[in-house]
């Protein structure tokens, strides 16, 4: 960056090179060029010459003042007009940064996705800091008192093999950057209570033409957890409001759930599960679309979906699984 240039003087920032966004700052430039008494000193920000708020302090030094500086990053350099020189002479340059100290991390959550072999910890970092901010996740065994620390820039995956201090732990997060540090509240966890079952997936849908047409949704999970509670939500794609059905599930076989739906309407389905009685849910599954026929039976599978129709024939279409704003992977 600009910091690595050869300098013929010095450039510096008061109060500091990294400062709180919105502060008033002063940038000083001090020339030390052989055989040059600078006629004029110039400041450049991101390559553009500054015209205002420049004060000459003495023969070799000038100051540039910014009120309420709001740019996260800027490259500053200054030059001198030397007698008998046609071009400006570079004095020095500096990259400056503004931002915020971190907020207190909150909503610390740790889960173990079944078969992942990891405990995944996440948190709400709060407002954007704009500057390099790191997080230290502290994991302390309540049985052995041993503490491990993990440095990260966002979330952390901790191998469950490294959690050798029994089942009960305290977890907390420390956020730090050049402007400050904050620490979350401590979260107490039991490893057996934070397992999220293997993802539930809707594989196909079928509408049976009976007296009252019935749609069957087929769905499954590879979980080995015995007691699992699930929710399936569904709505017409034109609607805002979801309908939710609850199930106590045993995944030794593919689940079939029945719905009585309006004909000739495109519906969307999602499913999520949790270990019965535990705290955390899976994120909602990918969107699964199914259009009910006017009168003709129809099958929609995970593999194929187009809104194509063939007179009287069973037709399949592709489930794109695009997420909508209603499809946040909430695990709380």
């Amino acid at each position: 960056g600009i910091t690595n240039i050869n300098c013929s003087g010095h450039i510096w920032v008061e109060p500091a090179t990294i400062f709180k966004m919105g502060m008033n700052i002063s940038i000083y430039c001090q020339a030390a060029i052989k055989n040059c008494q600078p006629r004029k000193l110039h400041f450049y920000k991101n390559g553009i010459k500054e015209r205002f708020q420049i004060t000459r302090i003495n023969k070799t030094t000038a100051r540039l003042w910014y009120k309420n500086f709001l740019e996260p990053h800027a490259s500053m350099y200054c030059t001198a007009e030397c007698p008998k020189h046609f071009q400006e002479t570079l004095i020095c340059g500096k990259d400056i940064s503004s931002g915020y100290p971190p907020d207190i991390p909150d909503e610390v959550t740790c889960v173990i996705y079944e078969y992942s072999g990891n405990m995944t910890c996440t948190w709400n970092a709060g407002k954007l800091t704009y500057i390099d901010t790191k997080y230290v996740v502290h994991v302390k065994s309540l049985e052995t008192e041993e503490e491990q620390q993990y440095l990260t820039s966002s979330y952390i995956n901790i191998s469950t093999d490294s959690l050798q201090g029994g089942k009960k732990y305290l977890v907390w997060v420390q956020a730090a950057n050049a402007l400050g540090m904050e620490e979350s509240k401590q979260l107490q966890i039991h490893l057996d209570d934070i397992v999220i079952p293997s993802a539930a997936v809707i594989s196909r849908a079928e509408t049976i033409n009976a007296t009252v047409p019935k749609t069957i949704i087929y769905w499954d999970s590879q979980t080995t957890i015995e007691k699992v509670s699930c929710e399936m939500r569904y709505k017409a794609t034109t609607n805002q409001t979801w309908n939710v059905k609850e199930f106590d599930t045993n995944f030794t076989y593919v689940q079939q759930s029945e719905f009585y739906l309006e004909p000739n309407i495109k519906y969307v389905f999602q499913v999520r599960c949790q270990e019965t009685g535990k705290r955390y849910w899976q994120p909602w599954s990918s969107l699964f679309f199914h259009k009910t026929p006017e009168t003709v039976p129809q099958v929609t599978s995970k593999a194929f979906q187009h809104d194509t129709w063939n007179s009287g024939l069973t037709v399949a279409s592709i489930s794109t699984g695009h997420l909508t704003s209603d499809n946040r992977g909430d695990i709380g």
Partner: antibody, heavy 119, light 108 residues
């Protein structure tokens, strides 16, 4: 000439509080961060926190939150640090240090205030 | 916290000898925010080298600093009596700002 003049030594009882001062002269007090550090006998230097006199913004080492409180009096160009609920672990020399942008470092230090906690 | 580990803890050098001490950070530190302080008994620390390699005002040219990432060093090209002191490295990269435990340099 820049100078940071700190208050004299303190002998205090366990559980008590102490408030020490750091008077700045020779520069514009409000324009520079003031940092505080702790140096225990035979131990390294520990950073306690800083205050920016212009705005009153503070930042603390998590270890000293609840132990130290930093304040300033702009009219007298003086920074203060109060330590509370003192124990023998708090016996140390405490320094204020100006953070100067020229070096982007703590460029001028006070002579230190010695605190001894003893019953 | 970024832990700054200095080695050796104590060293002695003869006058005129070349001296090198090291400082290792537990995670990467920007060279702009790695400083060295000199402290003599009964005195407060003094800024000695700033931003890894720049000498503070009044520091003799026999001192130099170098390094990047997690590994930094301070070198005296030719030891003089007045250089006997404790030298601390310090990172201002990320809060809490931390100091090394110091290298005490004595005259042999």
């Amino acid at each position: 000439e820049f100078q940071l003049q700190q208050s004299g030594p303190e002998l205090v009882k366990p559980g008590a509080s102490v408030k020490m001062s750091c008077k700045a002269s020779g520069y514009t007090f409000t324009n520079y961060y003031m940092h505080w550090v702790k140096q225990s006998h035979g131990k390294t230097i520990e950073w306690i926190g800083y205050i920016y006199p212009n705005s009153g913004d503070t930042s603390y080492n998590q270890k000293f939150k609840g132990k130290a409180t930093l304040t300033v009096d702009k009219s007298s160009s003086t920074a203060y640090m109060e330590l509370r609920s003192l124990t023998s672990e708090d016996s140390a020399v405490y320094n204020c240090a100006r953070f100067g942008g020229f070096y982007d470092a703590m460029d001028y230090w006070g002579q230190g205030t010695s605190v001894t906690v003893s019953s | 916290d970024i832990v700054m580990t200095q080695s050796p803890a104590i060293m002695s050098a003869s006058l005129g000898e070349r001296v090198t001490m090291t400082c290792t950070a537990s995670s990467s530190v920007s060279s702009s925010y790695l400083h060295w302080y000199q402290q003599k008994p009964g005195s407060s620390p003094k800024l000695w080298i700033y931003s890894t390699s720049n000498l503070a005002s009044g520091v003799p040219a026999r001192f130099s600093g170098s390094g990047s990432g997690t590994s930094y060093s301070l070198t005296i090209s030719s030891m003089e009596a007045e250089d006997a002191a404790t030298y601390y490295c310090h990172q201002y990269h990320r809060s809490p700002f931390t100091f090394g435990s110091g290298t005490k340099l004595e005259i042999k």
